[in-house]
């Protein structure tokens, strides 16, 4: 699987999950989250050569098409597969609230 | 929705489904499919600005991150959302067979 275990410990050039830290205030302009100050969101990057972790029948056909038509702009793209939630603390008035923000952290990628 | 109804009738520059006809023999090197000779597979293309048909919380965060960090290589990507099957006819010996190939036609796209 193109997950953090494999991708973070290899020099993989093809589609893989990459490290990305997002600072809520600096990168998103969000002041309302009290904790954490930021988080390891990660992101997906890299080409999707034939048959690199392809998602569907369509992406196999498209990758095959791309193999035979290298100049074509139609190609599979490296996108998140498994996402995880992020627990945050924010305030409503003076009252702290704990919330799980769903689908916030990329754990693995796929070619779609 | 970024579907064929909207995308084929507009000059949308952002993520949208685009027309792509695949000829089985010319584009894939397949001689074994008797009918059809090819099909309108379509493909997804276009930038994913904030907040253009974003798929998950994560893709919203990433698009916002991209807005604040325009030079970053981390950005949502335009990929298939709704896929449809394609019925084909092929021969096993002299016997014609009809098969539904699942997930072969892109009907709509999303930013993931």
């Amino acid at each position: 699987a193109l997950d953090t275990n494999y991708c973070f410990s290899s020099t993989e050039k093809n589609c893989c999950v990459r490290q990305l830290y997002i600072d809520f205030r600096k990168d998103l302009g969000w002041k309302w989250i009290h904790e954490p100050k930021g988080y390891h969101a990660n992101f997906c990057l890299g080409p999707c050569p034939y048959i690199w972790s392809l998602d569907t029948q369509y992406s196999k056909v498209l990758a095959l098409y791309n193999q035979h038509n290298p100049g074509a702009s139609a190609a599979p793209c490296c996108v998140p597969q498994a996402l995880e939630p992020l627990p945050i603390v924010y305030y409503v008035g003076r009252k702290p609230k704990v919330e799980q923000l769903s689908n916030m952290i990329v754990r693995s990628c796929k070619c779609s | 929705a970024l579907d064929t109804n909207y995308c084929f009738s507009s000059t949308e520059k952002n993520c949208c489904v685009r027309q792509l006809y695949i000829d089985f023999r010319k584009d894939l090197g397949w001689k074994w499919i008797h009918e059809p000779k090819g099909y309108h597979a379509n493909f997804c293309l276009g930038p994913c600005p904030y907040i253009w048909s974003l798929d998950t919380q994560y893709s919203k965060v990433l698009a916002l991150y991209n807005q604040h960090n325009p030079g970053a290589s981390a950005a949502p990507c335009c990929v298939p959302q709704a896929l449809e099957p394609l019925p084909i006819v092929y021969y096993v010996g002299r016997k014609p067979k009809v098969e539904q190939l699942s997930n072969m036609i892109v009907r709509s796209c999303k930013c993931s």
């Epitope: 095959l64 | 001689k31 074994w32």
Partner: nanobody, 114 residues
């Protein structure tokens, strides 16, 4: 159900040649492609070469050195590997995609070392 068996792997010196063979058994029809893939230790499985009915395609790293050939009558696939390099060391797998379903052989080890 399709079964694939590879043969022809072994230990060779840099610059030498090897020929891998793959035999497919079972009901072979509706073939999207047949191909050779390889997996080096700690790496993902990667395409080496693929063959559709009348088209072949190669990974950049093997172009000009490797040749894929297919005999549909005998349901066999071959990979002629010339000018082998140490970086070609991997387990080589035969693959057949039938109507969208992938079938794999158990693999054959190729080691290129002096």
């Amino acid at each position: 159900q399709v079964q694939l068996v590879e043969s022809g792997g072994g230990l060779v010196q840099p610059g030498e040649s090897l020929r891998l063979s793959c035999t497919a058994s079972g009901s072979i029809f509706g073939v999207f492609y047949m191909g050779w893939f390889r997996q080096a230790p700690g790496k993902q499985r990667d395409m080496v070469a693929i063959s559709t009915d009348d088209r072949t395609s190669y990974a950049d790293s093997v172009k000009g050195r490797f040749t894929i050939s297919r005999d549909n009558a005998k349901n066999t696939l071959a990979l002629q590997m010339n000018s082998l390099k140490p970086e070609d060391t991997a387990v080589y797998f035969c693959n057949l995609n039938q109507l969208g379903t992938d079938y794999w052989g158990p693999g054959t080890q190729v080691t290129v070392s002096s």
